[in-house]
C-alpha cells in the first residue's frame, strides 16, 4: 500500500543562458487531490515559480496538458534563462483544503546556468616604461557560470608564467568574475609585441575568448644619439649631423646648441621606421666656421616623449680654417636641415 510520491528524476540540469530549462516532475497518483506548485529554494523564504491552480507566470509553461483528468506529469519549462535563475527547484504537491496544505515535496532539481564570460579586457600601466623594466597587465572577464574557468597569458604566442588570478566571489553565486595580473619584462624589441589574455570556459565549446594589449602603448624606447662631422660641403662650411636611432614613440624634439646657446629647435616629422617598430631620424646643421675665432662645441639635445633631455656633443676645431673679416655671424643654417637615412 502506497501513498503519492513526487518524483523529480533529474538531480541537476544545466542550461545555457537564454535557453529554456525543462524541470521534470511526476506524481504517482491522482490523490490526494490538490494542486502542484514549483518553488525555488526551500524553507520560509522559498520563491514561488509556478502554481497550477492560480497566478500568472509568463515565463513558465507546462510540458504536458495539465487539464487532462489523468495527468500526473507536472514538468515545467522556464524560458529565457539567466544566471539569476540558478538554484534548486522543488515540485511540491499540495492537498486540497482551505487553504491548501503542503503534502509532499520532490527531492529537488538543481538548475545551473551556463553563462559565457564577457570578452576579456586587458589593460596596461598608465605610464610608459622603458626596456628592462617590469610592467603589470590586468585582465578582467565577468558574468560567467559555472565558476570553473581557465585563464592564460601570452606574449607573442609564448605562454607567460608570472601572473596571479582570482575568481570572485569565493562562495556560491549566480555568476562569477575573473581578475588576473601578469608581470611582463619589456625589451627593446617589444614595440610590435602583444600581450594576450586567453579565457577558456565550458560555454565556449573549446573556442577561447581573447583580449589583447599592444605593447606599443606601454613601451618607451629611448633614442641613441650620434653626432658626426661630415666632409666640408663648401669653403668655410661644415655639415654636422645628429643621428637619432631606435626610439619609440615618435614624439621627439631636437635642439642644436652652439657653445651652449640654442641654435635651432625642430620636431621629428619625416622619420624612418625600423623592422622592430622603432624609428630613426637625422638632423643636420651647417656651421660657418669662418664666423668663429675659437673651437665650437656643438650639442645635439633630444627630448623624447616628454622625458628629460639627453644630449651628445661634438667639438668643432676651427683653427685650421681662415677667418673671414668682419663676420659676426655665429652660424648660418641654409638649405634643408633634415635628411632621411636608410
Amino acid at each position: 500500500e502506497e501513498e503519492l510520491q513526487v518524483i523529480q528524476p533529474d538531480k541537476s540540469v544545466s542550461v545555457a543562458a537564454g535557453e529554456s530549462a525543462i524541470l521534470h516532475c511526476t506524481v504517482t497518483s491522482l490523490i490526494p487531490v490538490g494542486p502542484i506548485q514549483w518553488f525555488r529554494g526551500a524553507g520560509p523564504a522559498r520563491e514561488l515559480i509556478y502554481n497550477q491552480k492560480e497566478g500568472h507566470f509568463p515565463r513558465v509553461t507546462t510540458v504536458s496538458e495539465s487539464t487532462k483528468r489523468e495527468n500526473m506529469d507536472f514538468s515545467i519549462s522556464i524560458s529565457n534563462i539567466t544566471p539569476a535563475d540558478a538554484g534548486t527547484y522543488y515540485c511540491v504537491k499540495f492537498r486540497k483544503g482551505s487553504p491548501d496544505t503542503e503534502f509532499k515535496s520532490g527531492a529537488g532539481t538543481e538548475l545551473s546556468v551556463r553563462a559565457k564570460p564577457s570578452a576579456p579586457v586587458v589593460s596596461g600601466p598608465a605610464a610608459r616604461a622603458t626596456p628592462q623594466h617590469t610592467v603589470s597587465f590586468t585582465c578582467e572577464s565577468h558574468g560567467f557560470s559555472p565558476r570553473d574557468i581557465t585563464l592564460k597569458w601570452f606574449k607573442n604566442g609564448n605562454e607567460l608564467s608570472d601572473f596571479q588570478t582570482n575568481v570572485d566571489p569565493v562562495g556560491e553565486s549566480v555568476s562569477y568574475s575573473i581578475h588576473s595580473t601578469a608581470k611582463v619584462v619589456l625589451t627593446r624589441e617589444d614595440v610590435h609585441s602583444q600581450v594576450i589574455c586567453e579565457v577558456a570556459h565550458v560555454t565556449l565549446q573549446g573556442d577561447p575568448l581573447r583580449g589583447t594589449a599592444n605593447l606599443s602603448e606601454t613601451i618607451r624606447v629611448p633614442p641613441t644619439l650620434e653626432v658626426t662631422q661630415q666632409p666640408v660641403r663648401a669653403e668655410n662650411q661644415v655639415n654636422v649631423t645628429c643621428q637619432v636611432r631606435k626610439f619609440y614613440p615618435q614624439r621627439l624634439q631636437l635642439t642644436w646648441l652652439e657653445n651652449g646657446n640654442v641654435s635651432r629647435t625642430e620636431t621629428a616629422s619625416t622619420v624612418t621606421e625600423n623592422k622592430d617598430g622603432t624609428y630613426n631620424w637625422m638632423s643636420w646643421l651647417l656651421v660657418n666656421v669662418s664666423a668663429h675665432r675659437d673651437d665650437v662645441k656643438l650639442t645635439c639635445q633630444v627630448e623624447h616623449d616628454g622625458q628629460p633631455a639627453v644630449s651628445k656633443s661634438h667639438d668643432l676645431k676651427v683653427s685650421a680654417h681662415p677667418k673671414e673679416q668682419g663676420s659676426n655671424t655665429a652660424a648660418e643654417n641654409t638649405g634643408s636641415n633634415e635628411r632621411n637615412i636608410y
Epitope: E1, E2, E3, L4, T28, S29, L30, I31, P32, V33, R69, E70, R95, K96, G97, S98, D100
Partner: antibody, heavy 120, light 108 residues
Framework: QVQLQQSGPELVKPGASVKMSCKAS????????LSWVKQRTGQGLEWIGE????????YYNEKFKGKATLTADKSSNTAYIQLTSLTSEDSAVYFC?????????????WGQGTLLTVSA | ENVLTQSPEKMAVSLGQKVTMTCSAS???????LHWYQQKSGASPKPLIH???NLASGVPARFSGSGSGTSYSLTISSVEAEDAATYYC?????????FGGGTNLEIK
C-alpha cells in the same frame, strides 16, 4: 454505463477482520479514483478514504487510518476495503463511490452498499 | 475538518409546498465544491445538485440550490410524494471530504 457492484452482507465477530469488494464496470477502472463511505444505521455519511487504482495509491481520512485498508486489483476491475479489529462501532453500511471526474468532487456513481454487522 | 451542519434535522411538509433546507460549513467552501445528495430508505445516495446549483442528470427542475462561503441551501419549489427522503450536503473544498448530518423530509 458506469456501474459499481458491491459484495453481499457480512456478519462477523468482534476482533475479526472483513474484506468487502466493489467491482467496477462501464469505464476504465484504472483512471478514476474510488472512495469508500460509511453510514451507520440512522446516521449520516462518513468518508473513509480513496484509492487510485492506476498506481494503487491511497489516501485516508485520519479517523480511519489503522482501521481501514484500501486495495485494488486492476485485472478484475475490483476495489477492496478491509476492516480490522472489528467492534460494534464498525457495524454500518459501506458504500463505494466514484467522482463524476477527477476534478468534479461529487459522487456521481455509488455502489448499492454492503451491510456489515459485527456481533458476537 | 470542515464540519457541515444541516438544518432542520427533520421536516414534514404537505404536497405542493415549497421547502428550503440549509447547510452551514465551519469554514468557507468554494461554490463549485458544495454538492447535494438524496437518499431514500435502504438505497444508496443519489446525486442531486453539484457545484451549489447545477442539477445532476435526470433531476427534476423543481430542485434548486444556492449559497456561497459558509451558507448554502437546497430548495424544492413544489414538493411531490417521491421527494420523501434524507438530503445530504457534501463539501469538496478540503480533506477529509465531509457530509452534513442530513435533513429528513417527510410528506404529510
Amino acid at each position: 454505463q458506469v456501474q459499481l457492484q458491491q459484495s453481499g452482507p457480512e456478519l462477523v465477530k468482534p476482533g475479526a477482520s472483513v474484506k468487502m469488494s466493489c467491482k467496477a464496470s462501464g469505464y476504465t477502472f484504472s483512471e478514476y479514483v474510488l472512495s469508500w463511505v460509511k453510514q451507520r444505521t440512522g446516521q449520516g455519511l462518513e468518508w473513509i478514504g480513496e484509492i487510485y487504482p492506476g498506481t494503487i495509491t491511497t489516501y485516508y481520512n485520519e479517523k480511519f487510518k489503522g482501521k481501514a485498508t484500501l486495495t485494488a486489483d486492476k485485472s478484475s476491475n475490483t476495489a477492496y476495503i478491509q476492516l480490522t479489529s472489528l467492534t460494534s462501532e464498525d457495524s454500518a453500511v459501506y458504500f463505494c463511490g466514484r467522482f463524476y471526474d477527477y476534478d468534479g468532487g461529487w459522487f456521481a456513481y455509488w455502489g448499492q452498499g454492503t451491510l456489515l454487522t459485527v456481533s458476537a | 475538518e470542515n464540519v457541515l451542519t444541516q438544518s432542520p434535522e427533520k421536516m414534514a411538509v404537505s404536497l405542493g409546498q415549497k421547502v428550503t433546507m440549509t447547510c452551514s460549513a465551519s469554514s468557507s467552501v468554494s461554490s463549485s465544491d458544495l454538492h447535494w445528495y438524496q437518499q431514500k430508505s435502504g438505497a444508496s445516495p443519489k446525486p442531486l445538485i453539484h457545484g451549489t446549483s447545477n442539477l445532476a442528470s435526470g433531476v427534476p427542475a423543481r430542485f434548486s440550490g444556492s449559497g456561497s462561503g459558509t451558507s448554502y441551501s437546497l430548495t424544492i419549489s413544489s414538493v411531490e410524494a417521491e421527494d420523501a427522503a434524507t438530503y445530504y450536503c457534501q463539501q469538496w473544498s478540503g480533506y477529509p471530504w465531509t457530509f452534513g448530518g442530513g435533513t429528513n423530509l417527510e410528506i404529510k
